[in-house]
């Protein structure tokens, strides 16, 4: 009886098991009982990343500089191009189809996790004893100045946006 299922890396056509084309190659013609599957290498800027019976290769992804993209890894006949973002930007999706500027942490907030090529900045509110007075994508919350260690006293309390103001101790006359 003709086969109803085929081995791995084969496909069933016309009651016959034919070899799939290897990654990096596309199908030109199905096998017969006299000749094997005919496959051809993908062209320049094309790829196929699996054993396949595709008649067309896929185009490599284009890393559009107008969208802030650059090539992280050049594609081959078996792999797609991997795009990443230019310095100071991160991908807006898993497939990195566009980029966005890293979000700065506003005053009162500090950087908990720096942005990467794939993730945005993670900010957190400065807790008591810490402040941030700048809008920055890399500055953490800074601890208030310790007036005591400088033999000074607090003249103005700190907030999450401002440091304490130290001053000299009043002398008893």
């Amino acid at each position: 009886e003709p086969p109803t299922a085929c081995r791995e890396k084969q496909y069933l056509i016309n009651s016959q098991c034919c070899s799939l084309c290897q990654p990096g190659q596309k199908l030109v013609s199905d096998c017969t009982e006299f000749t094997e599957t005919e496959c051809l290498p993908c062209g320049e800027s094309e790829f196929l990343d699996t054993w396949n019976r595709e008649t067309h290769c896929h185009q490599h992804k284009y890393c559009d500089p107008n969208l802030g993209l650059r090539v992280q890894q050049k594609g081959t006949s078996e792999t797609d191009t991997i795009c990443t973002c230019k310095e100071g930007q991160h991908c807006t999706s898993k497939d990195c189809e566009a980029c966005a500027q890293h979000t700065p942490c506003i005053p009162g907030f500090g950087v908990m996790e720096m942005a990467t090529e794939t993730t945005d900045t993670v900010c957190h509110p400065c807790p008591v004893g810490f402040f941030s007075n700048v809008s920055s994508a890399f500055e953490k919350c800074h601890p208030w100045t310790s007036c005591e260690t400088k033999d000074l006293v607090v003249q103005q309390a700190g907030t999450n946006k401002t440091d304490v103001v130290c001053g000299p101790q009043d002398r008893l006359r």
Partner: antibody, heavy 117, light 107 residues
Framework: EVQLLESGGGLVQPGGSLRLSCAAS????????MSWVRQAPGKGLEWVSG????????YYADSVKGRFTISRDNSKNTLYLQMNSLRAEDTAVYYC??????????WGQGTLVTVSS | DIQMTQSPSSLSASVGDRVTITCRAS??????LNWYQQKPGKAPKLLIY???SLQSGVPSRFSGSGSGTDFTLTISSLQPEDFATYYC?????????FGQGTKLEIK
């Protein structure tokens, strides 16, 4: 024991016709692809035509396309080659062969076709 | 059609010799190549299939190698019964095609 026995060869004039037969025995004929291969006197081998198993497709060398027709009768365990519009360059020993995994593992003894006026 | 070119066309050797016959395809055929032996007045016999697999019943002194466009048939130690004509045959593209043959003669 696998056996393939060709018949039907002979002398024919250019433009004439001939039908070759190949009687198969010793195996399940319908389960195998079959082919015809020829060899001109003192020359090499030339694949002529093939027919798939289970009533599969038919395939021809460009040199015989449109003139030769391969067929099979699974009930009679017989392979045929109908040859029309014969030319002097078709003169050869014609072998039938059984196919398995893209190779011809059993061959007949051949039958001589001579095209001459 | 794919052209198959064998070399040499003829070869003289002695019993016990190691012999290599080459076959070149006009384009890549992966490992889709068979080797046949033919003795005068007889039908061809399949020796090697898929470039390097030995057909059942064929002595182990026969071996095949190669892929892409260049292939070789090697007989490690010639026996008297090995003097014959050898053909390569590709099955990577329709139609299947044979090399022109290599005639192996006794020196």
């Amino acid at each position: 024991e696998v056996q393939l026995l060709e018949s039907g060869g002979g002398l024919v004039q250019p433009g004439g016709s001939l039908r070759l037969s190949c009687a198969a025995s010793g195996f399940t004929f319908s389960s195998y692809a079959m082919s015809w291969v020829r060899q001109a006197p003192g020359k090499g081998l030339e694949w002529v035509s093939g027919i798939g198993s289970y009533g599969g497709g038919t395939y021809y060398a460009d040199s015989v396309k449109g003139r030769f027709t391969i067929s099979r009768d699974n009930s009679k365990n017989t392979l045929y080659l109908q040859m029309n519009s014969l030319r002097a360059e078709d003169t050869a020993v014609y072998y039938c062969a059984r196919y398995v995994n893209f190779g011809m593992d059993y061959w007949g003894q051949g039958t001589l076709v001579t095209v001459s006026s | 059609d794919i052209q198959m070119t064998q070399s040499p066309s003829s070869l003289s050797a002695s019993v016990g010799d190691r012999v290599t016959i080459t076959c070149r395809a006009s384009q890549s055929i992966s490992s889709y190549l068979n080797w046949y032996q033919q003795k005068p007045g007889k039908a061809p016999k399949l020796l090697i299939y898929a470039a390097s697999s030995l057909q059942s019943g064929v002595p182990s002194r026969f071996s095949g190698s190669g892929s892409g466009t260049d292939f070789t048939l090697t007989i490690s130690s010639l026996q008297p019964e090995d003097f014959a004509t050898y053909y390569c045959q590709q099955y990577g593209r329709n139609p299947p095609t044979f090399g022109q043959g290599t005639k192996l003669e006794i020196k």
